[in-house]
Interface confidence: medium
């Protein structure tokens, strides 16, 4: 499988466990992968009684279920950790939960941050 039309080179990066894992807390991540593999961005978060707790954001390597998704939309009904993936630079900046059961769509807007580039 070659590159998709929306080629992903950079994603929003975030790590809630940045201190423990000795990484930056937030910024931009340059995506790198094998020549014939596609690249995606992802976001993962928890929802505790309506309070959104961002877990991680970043690059995500060649995943069939992320192909050709321009927006980051989680469809799992009520998981411990919500997850979405998408294709296109910084497509994981905004992320949405749209459960299959047809509940209300909830879109999460990121707070403005000063990005630092991760390589």
């Amino acid at each position: 499988s070659g590159r998709g039309e929306a080629e992903t080179r950079e994603c929003i990066y975030y790590n809630a466990n940045w201190e423990l894992e000795r990484t930056n807390q937030s910024g931009l991540e340059r995506c790198e992968g094998e020549q014939d593999k596609r690249l995606h961005c992802y976001a993962s978060w928890r929802n505790s009684s309506g309070t959104i707790e961002l877990v991680k954001k970043g690059c995500w390597l060649d995943d069939f279920n992320c192909y050709d998704r321009q927006e980051c939309v989680a469809t799992e009904e009520n998981p411990q950790v919500y997850f979405c993936c998408c294709e296109g630079n910084f497509c994981n900046e905004r992320f949405t939960h749209l459960p299959e059961a047809g509940g209300p769509e909830v879109t999460y807007e990121p707070p403005p941050t000063a990005p630092t580039l991760l390589t």
Epitope: G4, L61, Y67, D68
Partner: antibody, heavy 118, light 112 residues
Framework: QLVESGGGLVRPGRSLTLSCTAS????????MHWVRQAPGKGLEWVSG????????AYADSVKGRFIISRDNAKNSLYLEMNSLRAEDTAVYYC?????????????WGQGTSVTVSS | DIVMTQTPVSSPVTLGQPASISCRSS???????????LSWIQQRPGQPPRLLIY???NRFSGVPDRFSGSGAGTDFTLKISRVEAEDVGVYYC?????????FGQGTKVEIK
Amino acid sequence: QLVESGGGLVRPGRSLTLSCTASGFTFNDYAMHWVRQAPGKGLEWVSGISWNTNSKAYADSVKGRFIISRDNAKNSLYLEMNSLRAEDTAVYYCVRDGGRFYYGLDVWGQGTSVTVSS
Amino acid sequence: DIVMTQTPVSSPVTLGQPASISCRSSQSLIHSDGNTYLSWIQQRPGQPPRLLIYKISNRFSGVPDRFSGSGAGTDFTLKISRVEAEDVGVYYCAETSQVPHTFGQGTKVEIK
């Protein structure tokens, strides 16, 4: 729920199209796969298709002979099998791709049997 | 492609006793995101396969807690703490993080 159909007895070199009808979930949110099982043998991944049909992948053993497709409006997955060989004899399962982050191959159909014999 | 090898091929077990199945991959299954996408699939006689365990050790919905998965890197294990009659069947390990998905050759669990 996934229900396969279209299997049967077919002569070598002929064609057959398998269908899979999905219910109980939003079909067009998921990539889908075909996995087969020859009599008395293990599981073999055959082909996969992305949610919007833009990306398709095939096992080397069927590349150039089989075509995977889907119709999201009909909640249906298809496998067009051409130039069939005796070694294509198997039960063919339609399988939902629950997503790598979550479960992987999480919903399986009952399977449809294909026998290639003269 | 990744090759998955299971041992033993067959495992005769006494009811109520434990059973253990090993799976080894030809290369590390640790993904760049830190997760390992190794699943275990059960196939009872005459039935279609069904997902038991995902991401090494997570039980899928409805799977009894006598089933557990462990391992890392290239070596993985499925354990049944106390085998019941309904556990008879073939168990497959599967690598599902990339296409082509690859399966182990299967381990048959049968009652002695």
